[in-house]
Amino acid sequence: LVPPLRDREKRDSVCPQGKYIHPQNNSVCCTKCHKGTYLYNDCPGPGQDTDCRECESGSFTASENHLRHCLSCSKCRKEMGQVEISSCTVDRDTVCGCRKNQYRYYWSENLFQCFNCSLCLNGTVHLSCQEKQNTVCTCHAGFFLRENECVSCSNCKKTLECTKLCLPQTENVKGTEDSGTT
């Protein structure tokens, strides 16, 4: 059984940096495996080599470790619009990103989706689109911002937050809406 993380950290701190305590013999410190490799067998005794093996294709370790298995390479999620920036190697996970003129939106810590950068039609670019942030638009007079697009004030309804920005037009909209009721 793998001991809880806290216990492993406690045990590792007994040994100097770059070494870990032997799981069966806590008087022995074994050298950790380099990135790109994993622990096949613990060192037999003090001053003896740890048996580290290179990760197989489709797996990696990105730092020195004493893991019994390499980590599986991530796959870029096509359904989220992700593209592969660099493929997985034995010492580095796959790097996923977005296409040109797109930005990443993180739904959670480990899940992002690619969306097209807003063009700010009927407005001006206040802040350019960045890797993890959409363009910030400022709308021209007679337009209001909805879902990061500049929409005509003629589409402003009483229920929307645009009423203050579209005050003169809203009065007209209200007039036509009200006149239509019986």
Epitope: K78, E79, Q113, N134, N148
Partner: nanobody
Framework: EVQLLESGGGLVQPGGSLRLSCAAS????????MVWVRQAPGKGLEWVSH????????FYADSVKGRFTISRDNSKNTLYLQMNSLRAEDTAVYHC????????????WGQGTLVTVSS
């Protein structure tokens, strides 16, 4: 008109199981990536899981990995969420939704079904 109707929620004890369903209509279900999101009382939306059109390689949030299973039946236009080993922190309204396309908001999502995990 896109319609998403969730069912299967209810009161369950910790450690129990529930199976949620989402009946979809008004669009080509088999072409769309489908999502389960949840909203716990007084909290924001949390992405739970999603499944691509072919059902392959679904995604799970770390908080539900190993306990929840998402699946779909394209012939029945239905999305499922099998929830096992339920915990108090899974208490929420569960919504099914179409994967957003235009931006980070849900254009189409159901009213939700309430899952309460309590002893």
């Amino acid at each position: 008109e896109v319609q998403l109707l969730e069912s299967g929620g209810g009161l369950v004890q910790p450690g129990g199981s529930l199976r949620l369903s989402c009946a979809a209509s008004g669009f080509t279900f088999a072409h769309e990536t489908m999502v389960w999101v949840r909203q716990a009382p007084g909290k924001g939306l949390e992405w739970v899981s999603h499944i691509p059109p072919d059902g392959q390689d679904p995604f799970y949030a770390d908080s539900v990995k190993g306990r929840f299973t998402i699946s779909r039946d394209n012939s029945k236009n239905t999305l499922y969420l099998q929830m096992n080993s339920l915990r108090a922190e899974d208490t929420a309204v569960y919504h099914c939704a179409l994967l957003p396309k235009r931006g980070p908001w849900f254009d189409y999502w159901g009213q939700g079904t309430l899952v309460t995990v309590s002893s």
